[in-house]
Interface confidence: low
Amino acid sequence: MQQDGLGVGTRNGSGKGRSVHPSWPWCAPRPLRYFGRDARARRAQTAAMALLAGGLSRGLGSHPAAAGRDAVVFVWLLLSTWCTAPARAIQVTVSNPYHVVILFQPVTLPCTYQMTSTPTQPIVIWKYKSFCRDRIADAFSPASVDNQLNAQLAAGNPGYNPYVECQDSVRTVRVVATKQGNAVTLGDYYQGRRITITGNADLTFDQTAWGDSGVYYCSVVSAQDLQGNNEAYAELIVLGRTSGVAELLPGFQAGPIED
C-alpha cells in the first residue's frame, strides 16, 4: 500500500493525538516544547540575555583560537518523535536533543532510523528550512516571546512552535545532503562544505557557519516502507561567542574547542 511516502508528518497543529505503540518501545514523545512557561526555554532565554549583557566580552580569554572568532553556535535540537505502528513503517528517532558548539567547530545532528522491511537501501534526506521567526532576536527579548507563546498556550495549542511551524512558501528551503547506500550527495547550496551523513543517518558538519542557523529535517524514504514517523527535525542557532556556556545552559553539551 503506497502512502505518505516522502515526509510522513510528525507534528500536528494541536500537538494532540500522540501515541507510543508498545511494538515501538524505542519511540519517545517530543522531548521539549518552546512555550513561555517552559523552564528550560526560560533558562535558554536568560542565558542568551546574559551573553548579550556581558557584551560578549568575556570571550575565551587565553584560548589562541578566540581572536577574531567571537561567536558561539547554540544548537537546539528540538526533535519531533511521535510514533505510530503501521504494518510496514519507518521510524526516525534522535539520541541527543541538545548541543552547544563553537562557530567553526564541528557538530553532529543525530538521526537514526529503523525499518520493518529492508529489501532496498532507504534514502536519507536532510533538508534545511529557515526559521519562521527570528529565534535569536526573541532570545534577547523574552517578554515578547512569552506574550506570544503564552497566548498560544491559552488558546489550547501548547504544541505550537512559532519558529518551526509555518508554510514553506514564506521561508528558505534547501536540501542539505542525501544518502543512499554509501553515496552521499550535497545539495547545490552546500557544495564545497565539509558536510556528510555518517553512521545511520547523522548529519555532520566539520565546521559550522553563520548561515547554518535554521531547522534541519531528517527524513528517511523507502519505496517499501511508506508509513510511519519518518521525519524528525532539529533547530540550529548561531549566536555570539563567549565562555561559560555549559554553566549558563544546564543540560547542553559543549562541543570541542580546537585550534
Epitope: D4, V8, G9, R11
Partner: antibody
Framework: AVTLDESGGGLQTPGGALSLVCKAS????????MNWVRQAPSKGLEWVAG????????DYGAAVKGRATISRDNGQSTVRLQLNNLRAEDTATYYC????????WGHGTEVIVS | ALTQPASVSANPGETVKITCSGG????????YGWYQQKSPGSAPVTMI???NNRPSNIPSRFSGSLSGSTNTLTITGVQADEAVYYC??????????FGAGTTLTV
C-alpha cells in the same frame, strides 16, 4: 472505494482569491500525502501543492509559490488549497490527488479567472 | 521536468513501451507514476504508481519498470488504449513534477 471530491471552483476575478476543498473517503486519510494538480486548457498536468499526512511538510509548485497555502483537516478528511492574487494563467481544472506517488484522483473542479 | 516522447503508435495486439526520465533529481532515487487521460478535461487515471505498482482496477497488461533513472510503461497487447499518458515523479521530498505527455495512437 477511494473517493476524492473537489469543490470551490467557478468563475474568479483576477487579483482575487479562491479556496478549493477536497473531501476524501474510503481510506485512512491521515496516512496519505495529498496533492493538488491542475491542468490548463489544452495543456499538460502541473503539480501545484502537496502536504504530508500529519501536516508537518508542505511544498508548492513554482507557479504558485508565495500565493498558495495547502492545509488539511485529518478529522474531517479534507484538504484545502487557498490561492491568492489570481491570474489568468491560473485558469485550469484542479484535481485533488492522493499519495506521494499519486494513486488516486478526484474528478476535478474547473476554475476560470477572467 | 520529466522527459517522455511526444507520441508513439502501435497496432492492436502489439507491445508499446513509453519511457520517462529526469525524476528524483534531489536524492538519487526514483519514484515514478503513469497517468492516463482519455480526453482533455477528463480526470487522469493512475495506471502505475511507485514505479511498478498497479491499482487493482487496472488491467495486468499495463506494467512499469525502473532501470537506472528511467521508468518505462509497458502496454502488452495494446487494445483501445488511445490516450495521453503522463509520467509523474516525486521531486524534492514531497514536490511533484510531470512530463509533457505522450500521445498513444493505436
Amino acid at each position: 472505494a477511494v473517493t476524492l471530491d473537489e469543490s470551490g471552483g467557478g468563475l474568479q476575478t483576477p487579483g482575487g482569491a479562491l479556496s478549493l476543498v477536497c473531501k476524501a473517503s474510503g481510506f485512512t486519510f491521515s496516512d496519505y500525502q495529498m496533492n493538488w494538480v491542475r491542468q490548463a486548457p489544452s495543456k499538460g498536468l502541473e503539480w501545484v501543492a502537496g502536504i504530508n499526512g500529519r501536516s508537518s511538510w508542505t511544498d508548492y509548485g513554482a507557479a504558485v509559490k508565495g500565493r498558495a497555502t495547502i492545509s488539511r483537516d485529518n478529522g474531517q478528511s479534507t484538504v484545502r488549497l487557498q490561492l491568492n492574487n489570481l491570474r489568468a494563467e491560473d485558469t485550469a481544472t484542479y484535481y485533488c490527488a492522493r499519495g506521494s506517488s499519486i494513486d488516486a484522483w478526484g474528478h476535478g473542479t474547473e476554475v476560470i479567472v477572467s | 521536468a520529466l522527459t517522455q516522447p511526444a507520441s508513439v503508435s502501435a497496432n492492436p495486439g502489439e507491445t508499446v513501451k513509453i519511457t520517462c526520465s529526469g525524476g528524483g533529481s534531489y536524492y538519487g532515487s526514483y519514484y515514478y507514476g503513469w497517468y492516463q487521460q482519455k480526453s482533455p478535461g477528463s480526470a487522469p487515471v493512475t495506471m502505475i504508481y511507485n514505479n511498478n505498482n498497479r491499482p487493482s482496477n487496472i488491467p495486468s497488461r499495463f506494467s512499469g519498470s525502473l532501470s537506472g533513472s528511467t521508468n518505462t510503461l509497458t502496454i502488452t497487447g495494446v487494445q483501445a488504449d488511445e490516450a495521453v499518458y503522463y509520467c509523474g515523479s516525486i521531486d524534492s521530498n514531497i514536490a511533484g513534477v510531470f512530463g509533457a505527455g505522450t500521445t498513444l495512437t493505436v
